[in-house]
Structures are given as C-alpha cells and as structure tokens.
C-alpha cells in the first residue's frame, strides 16, 4: 500500500473474519426478528477513487471501534474468552501496523480531511450499534446480529484495502 504495511495485513484481516465467524454461539436463523439495518456507510468503501489516507483511516477507525465494542464487560460475558482474546490480539496487531502507516501517509502530505471525515461517519455508525445492544438488553440474539453486522462491514472494508493493493500493483507494473 505504498508504505511498510506488511503483506500479512490482508491475512490478519482474514483471520479476524474467521475468528468472528468462530465466535458465533447461536444460529442467526433464531434471530430473524432481531435484525436491524444499521446503515453502514457503503459509499465510504465502494468508491473507485481510493486515496491511501482514506483507506488507512477507514480501516483504522473500523478496527479501533471493533476493538472497543468487543473489549467491554458485556462483551466478555457474551463470548468465548479464548476466541475473544485472540480477536483482541489480532486487532491490536493490525492497529499498530496501520498507525505506523498512517503517520507515514500524513508525512507524505495527504489531506487530513481524508482521515478525519471517515472517522466521524464510522463513529456514528458504531454508536447506532451500541444503542441497539442497549435497547435489546445485550441479549444473545442482539450480540449475534451485531457479530454478523461487524463481519459485513469488515468484509467490505478489507475488500476496499484489496482494491487499493491491486491498484498499487497495477501502477507498479505499468
């Protein structure tokens, strides 16, 4: 991605998705009535004009918010602790990689706006998720709906990362 973001960052993201999948405790089929449209801001991750700073910022904020969401007492009560610890460790590693990268990208002069704007949008989105959990009294189905939602948004975000990586590869080979 034009900085020292390790090649294994994509692998770490994939591992995070696997962990989130393994964390599942009940079938989503039991939770049809609890589903909610959290309105993930897809326009943020589906654009074709991808800036390095934007991609880094989206990924960083996503991972930071996921870390916070799954790093609470409520979360510890809801999920398998071994898997939760693995999730925390993986997210922490990815955040460290991204922070190194973000510093470099900002140093290269990419706009601060590209970094602050996605962060605010994502904070609002995650706030909606927290409100939903509280409304549903942190029920098993509420956590299951949230787990699925986090997987959806993380999948879209890592896809955006892959698109930028392949764009960089194309530029490098031309």
């Amino acid at each position: 991605l034009g900085c020292d973001l390790p090649q294994n960052h994509g692998l770490l993201s994939r591992n995070t998705l696997v962990l989130l999948h393994q964390m599942r405790r009940i079938s989503p089929f039991l939770c049809l009535k609890d589903r909610r449209d959290f309105r993930f801001p897809q326009e943020m991750v589906k654009g074709s004009q991808l800036q390095k700073a934007h991609v880094m910022s989206v990924l960083h904020e996503m991972l930071q918010q996921i870390f916070s969401l799954f790093h609470t007492e409520r979360s510890s009560a809801a999920w398998n602790m071994t898997l939760l610890d693995q999730l925390h460790t993986g997210l922490h590693q990815q955040l460290q990689h991204l922070e190194t990268c973000l510093l470099q990208v900002v140093g290269e002069g990419e706009s601060a706006g590209a970094i602050s704007s996605p962060a605010l949008t994502l904070r609002r989105y995650f706030q909606g998720i927290r409100v939903y959990l509280k409304e549903k009294k942190y029920s098993d189905c509420a956590w299951e709906v949230v787990r699925m939602e986090i997987m959806k948004s993380l999948f879209l975000s890592t896809n955006m990362q892959e698109r930028l990586r392949s764009k960089d590869r194309d530029l490098g080979s031309s």
Epitope: H21, Q22, S27, F29, D37, E149, K152, F155
Partner: antibody, heavy 124, light 107 residues
C-alpha cells in the same frame, strides 16, 4: 473449500420413509447451518427447513411439520433429512445447502454451497 | 407465507442483449432477497445475496437492485453461458420461499 456430498438415489413405495444424508468436507465449521431444499421434476425450488449441527436447533416449513425430521451427527460432519408418509408428490431431487456465502462476508441467509442432490422417486 | 412472483416466467434473448428479470413479494421483505442460477440437470448456484451483493466469482455483468416488494436481476450483456433458469429467494421470514423461476432461452 467446503463440499457437501449426498447419499444416492432412492425408490420408495407410498407411505414409506426415506432418509437422505449430507456429508460436509473441506473447510467446514460445525456451527454452519444446513438447509434442505427440494425440486419436483420440471418445477421450482421449495425450502423445507434448516438445522444447526452444533446446537441442534432446527426449523421446518409448516407444510412438512409432522412428516419431516432433520438430524445431524457433528462428529462425522453429516446431516440427515428423513421424510415419512411418502406420497407421489414427494418425488423430487432433495438438496442440502450450507447457509452462508462462499467467503466470510457475514451474510448467513444465502445458500452458497449445495450438495449434488439426491433423487427420491415415490411409486407403487 | 410470503409469495414471490417472478416475471416473465420465460424469455428469449440473444447474446449481447440486456436482460431484466423482476421479483415481486406479497409483503415488504426489506433487502432480504437472494438470486440463484440453475442450468438443466445442475445444482442451483448463488449469484447475488442481500439484493445487490455479487457472490465471489460471479461476473460483473450480473447486478441486483430493489427493496421492499420489488426487486430486479439484470444481465447487462447476455453471454452464451447465461442461458439458464433464475430464481429469487426471500429470507425476511420463515418459511424461506423461492420465486417460480425465469427461464432464459436462446432466441
């Protein structure tokens, strides 16, 4: 890559029961829900029910209640469909299908991997 | 039960044509709709999940749209391998139900 392999074709008499198996192999998770869908000759698809092999949670389409039993043995990654009181209109290809897309997208209500189908013929 | 009505039930088209198939639900199903393709004697294959998301490996000429009760599957430029039957499926409520299918034939 996940694969679902189903048991062979069956010919049954009206009133009899049939049991179809569906074995998962490859990169499987025991928590994955297995759905059953059937297709009568020249007709469309009909959803019958689902089961989670891990928790044993199960759901049936009302139409099949009392006749359909979905079971599983997670130690051998196999799910089963048993349909009793067979009638000629149960003649169909029966498919098992894993809930979820082929990659981990968080979408669990799409049927992303299908078994090859088991033909069940009910005839006197 | 939620009924899904697909139209047309069959259509004839040529390679390169733009093809649109619609799926109408008897009640609001939000965005909870998938599309499948089935070729004669073959197993159904997931094309599009949750209205508009392309399954991995599905060509970008396929697209889905809609919400509520009205959904469409579009093939922007029909290819020889696209001649098949297409089914929509809702998962708003149990029992999950499929549309009756749309058979796309060669003109």
């Amino acid at each position: 890559q996940v694969q679902l392999v189903q048991s062979g074709a069956e010919v049954k008499k009206p009133g009899a029961s049939v049991k179809v198996s569906c074995k998962a192999s490859g990169q499987t998770f025991t928590s994955d829900d297995i759905n059953w869908v059937r297709q009568a000759p020249g007709q469309g698809l009909e959803w019958m029910g689902w089961r989670n092999p891990n928790t044993q949670d199960t759901g049936y389409a009302q139409k099949f209640h009392g006749r359909l039993t979905l079971t599983s043995n997670s130690s051998i990654s196999t799910s089963y469909l048993e349909l009793s009181g067979l009638r000629s209109e149960d003649t169909a290809v029966y498919y098992c299908a894993r809930a979820g897309t082929s990659t981990l997208t968080g979408h669990y209500f799409a049927l992303g991997v299908w078994g090859q189908g088991t033909t069940v013929i009910v005839s006197s | 039960d939620i009924q899904l009505t697909q139209s047309p039930s069959s259509l004839s088209a040529s390679v390169g044509d733009r093809v649109t198939i619609t799926c109408q639900a008897t009640q609001d199903i939000s965005k909870y709709l998938n599309w499948y393709q089935q070729k004669p004697g073959k197993v159904p294959k997931l094309l599009i999940y949750e209205t508009s998301n392309l399954e991995v490996g599905v060509p970008s000429r396929f697209s889905g749209s809609g919400s509520g009760t009205h959904f469409t599957l579009t093939i922007s430029s029909l290819q020889a391998e696209d001649f098949a039957t297409y089914y929509c499926q809702q998962y708003e409520n149990f029992p999950f139900t499929f549309g009756g299918g749309t058979k796309v034939e060669i003109k």
